[in-house]
Interface confidence: low
């Protein structure tokens, strides 16, 4: 009977860590000589298994090749890794008396595709916080997957975003692959509670995509609106001033009251009010003793938010000498905000 080496499967797919069987059958036991498994072709091919009784980690023959009539030279590879990917050949040799064994026939080859799961996607954003209306880039990276086919999608609050660029490397054949994708997002003032999600779908994930999340609260700065108002006096010789910083994020806020340009009180906010959109409000009260001020006084509320230039709001209080009623003071807000760039 004519010798024929048959590898029935052109390819097999196996998840990393699992086992796979590479089938090989012969039609004849003649001529006498060994059967060997190789990965690859040509001079650089790698000997994988030779049925010579030696111990090879992770590889076993499927049938008992010591039996005289055995024609099944299939092997099982256990705990497969991406490095095991490649084309495996079952090769029949003829035993030489003095010269080396001669290769007489090879099977058609079986390609092993190792299915390796992608790593959980990591989403990175800009180093510095952006402001509403600014367009910022987020990058999603996942690595170590195989095969190369992979789907990556971006979402912001449930809405799909189209990436600027998505690349899978390397472009050629490799044991495993990496993906990198960049998306452009327009920040808006309501984004403190928003999330940008990178979703990776791959054959190894069984319809359960992996997600990487970037909370936009880590990448956005919403500057406060600052207002100074006068409250109704609590007694005849007191004026209550209120400085309100509204809708800011993050929490980092310093508030200073000044009288005629001199620091009067440092207010380190502790109890901030949180809005439903994730931003904060803060109100600082400043009690002015009118009897202590005969001249006009400019009270300034200076707000420094997240190491940004200070926002200032002025409020002028007319002195005791201007008042016809000795128990009251007149106040005039200065609506012009000045920005202190120091």
């Amino acid at each position: 009977k004519e010798l024929k080496v048959t590898q029935p499967e052109k390819s097999v797919s196996v998840a990393a860590g699992d086992s796979t069987v590479l089938n090989c059958t012969l039609t004849s036991l003649l001529p006498v000589g060994p059967i060997r498994w190789y990965r690859g072709v040509g001079p650089s091919r790698l000997l994988i298994y030779s049925f010579a009784g030696e111990y090879v980690p992770r590889i076993r023959n499927v049938s008992d090749t010591t039996k005289r009539n055995n024609m099944d030279f299939s092997i099982r590879i256990s705990n497969v890794t991406p490095a095991d990917a490649g084309i495996y050949y079952c090769v029949k040799f003829q035993k030489g008396s003095s010269e080396p064994d001669t290769e007489i026939q090879s099977g058609g080859g079986t390609e092993v595709y190792v299915l390796a799961k992608p790593s959980p996607p990591e989403v990175s954003g800009p180093a510095d916080r952006g402001i509403p209306d600014q367009k910022v880039n987020f990058t999603c990276k996942s690595h170590g997957f195989s095969p190369r086919n992979i789907t990556l999608k971006w979402f912001k609050d449930g809405q799909e975003l189209h990436p600027l660029e998505t690349t899978v490397n390397p472009s050629g054949k490799n044991v495993s692959y990496n993906i990198s994708s960049t998306v452009r997002v327009v920040l808006n003032s309501m984004d403190v509670n928003s999330k940008v999600i990178c979703e990776v779908a791959h054959i190894t994930l069984d319809r359960s995509p992996l997600r990487g999340i970037a909370n936009l609260s880590n990448f956005i700065r919403v500057s406060p609106t600052v207002k100074v108002t006068q409250q109704s006096p609590t007694s005849m010789n007191q004026v209550n001033l209120t400085c309100r910083a509204e809708r800011f994020y993050p929490e980092d806020l310093q508030l200073i009251w000044l009288e005629n340009g001199n620091v009067s009180r440092n207010d380190t906010p502790k109890n901030l009010t949180k809005n439903t959109d994730g931003t904060y409000n803060y109100t600082s009260l400043f009690l002015v003793n009118s009897s202590a001020h005969r001249e006009d006084v400019v009270f300034t509320c200076q707000v420094k938010h997240d190491q940004q230039p200070a926002i200032t709001r002025n409020h002028t209080v007319l002195g005791f000498a201007h008042s016809s009623d000795q128990g009251s003071m007149q106040t005039f807000p200065d609506n012009n905000a000045t920005h202190n760039w120091n």
Epitope: G130, D133, Q134, N137, H162, P163, L164, R184, V186
Partner: antibody
Framework: QVQLQESGPGLVKPSQTLSLTCTVS??????????WSWIRQHPGKGLEWIGA???????YYNPSLKSRVTISVDTSKNQFSLKLSSVTAADTAVYYC???????????WGQGTTVTVSS | DIQMTQSPSSLSASVGDRVTITCQAS??????LNWYQQKPGKAPKLLIY???NLATGVPSRFSGSGSGTDFTFTISSLQPEDIATYYC?????????FGGGTKVEIK
């Protein structure tokens, strides 16, 4: 409504730097929501996107020109600019500036300015 | 870069005819495609954005369709003022790229 106007020399010598400015009127360049782009068109040919800038910083360039292109913005003058270094005759073209909406195309264009590279 | 292939490169049609231009992207660009009209000596004008949305002030005889790699631009009834070159442009992947253009003439 927003209008764009390109300005700059119509003739540039080879190896020199081409400099163009686009002035935005009828709206603020820093109001957000738009990219400000440069596009060119070689004589009798199609359109080539050069690059775009957002008022607060991000800039994108066409890789084929990236080594020679600089796009910048001056919000105080409501202008954005293009510089193309080491020009050759192949850079002779009509240069357009345009406003690009986030997902709504280049909806406002300047009338274009012809730049000839010749000694 | 994404290659945008427009066809035909030129066409001649009669007033009132239906005119169709196609644009093919070298890979999937979803619906991230715009169409522009350029008359001689003038700047391009946006007609269609996001493959099928009519830009403000553009007559309803212009329309666009398609998604993925194949797109179509249609003038339902050609008018004399429609004599121009039409370009498709993708904005799915940097750099933005344009088709080679289709010159439309009246017979």
């Amino acid at each position: 409504q927003v209008q764009l106007q390109e300005s700059g020399p119509g003739l540039v010598k080879p190896s020199q730097t081409l400099s163009l400015t686009c002035t935005v009127s009828g709206g603020s360049i820093s109001s957000g929501g738009y990219y400000w782009s440069w596009i060119r068109q070689h004589p009798g040919k199609g359109l080539e996107w050069i690059g775009a800038i957002y008022y607060s910083g991000p800039i994108y360039y066409n890789p084929s020109l990236k080594s020679r292109v600089t796009i910048s913005v001056d919000t105080s003058k409501n202008q954005f600019s293009l510089k193309l270094s080491s020009v050759t005759a192949a850079d002779t073209a009509v240069y357009y500036c345009a406003r690009e909406g986030y997902h709504s195309g280049m909806d406002v264009w300047g009338q274009g300015t012809t730049v000839t590279v010749s000694s | 870069d994404i290659q945008m292939t427009q066809s035909p490169s030129s066409l001649s049609a009669s007033v009132g005819d239906r005119v169709t231009i196609t644009c093919q992207a070298s890979q999937d660009i979803s619906n991230y495609l715009n169409w522009y009209q350029q008359k001689p000596g003038k700047a391009p004008k946006l007609l269609i954005y996001d493959a099928s949305n009519l830009a403000t002030g553009v007559p309803s005889r212009f329309s666009g369709s398609g998604s993925g790699t194949d797109f179509t631009f249609t003038i339902s009834s050609l008018q004399p003022e429609d004599i121009a070159t039409y370009y498709c442009q993708q904005f799915a992947y940097l750099p933005w790229t344009f088709g080679g253009g289709t010159k439309v003439e009246i017979k």
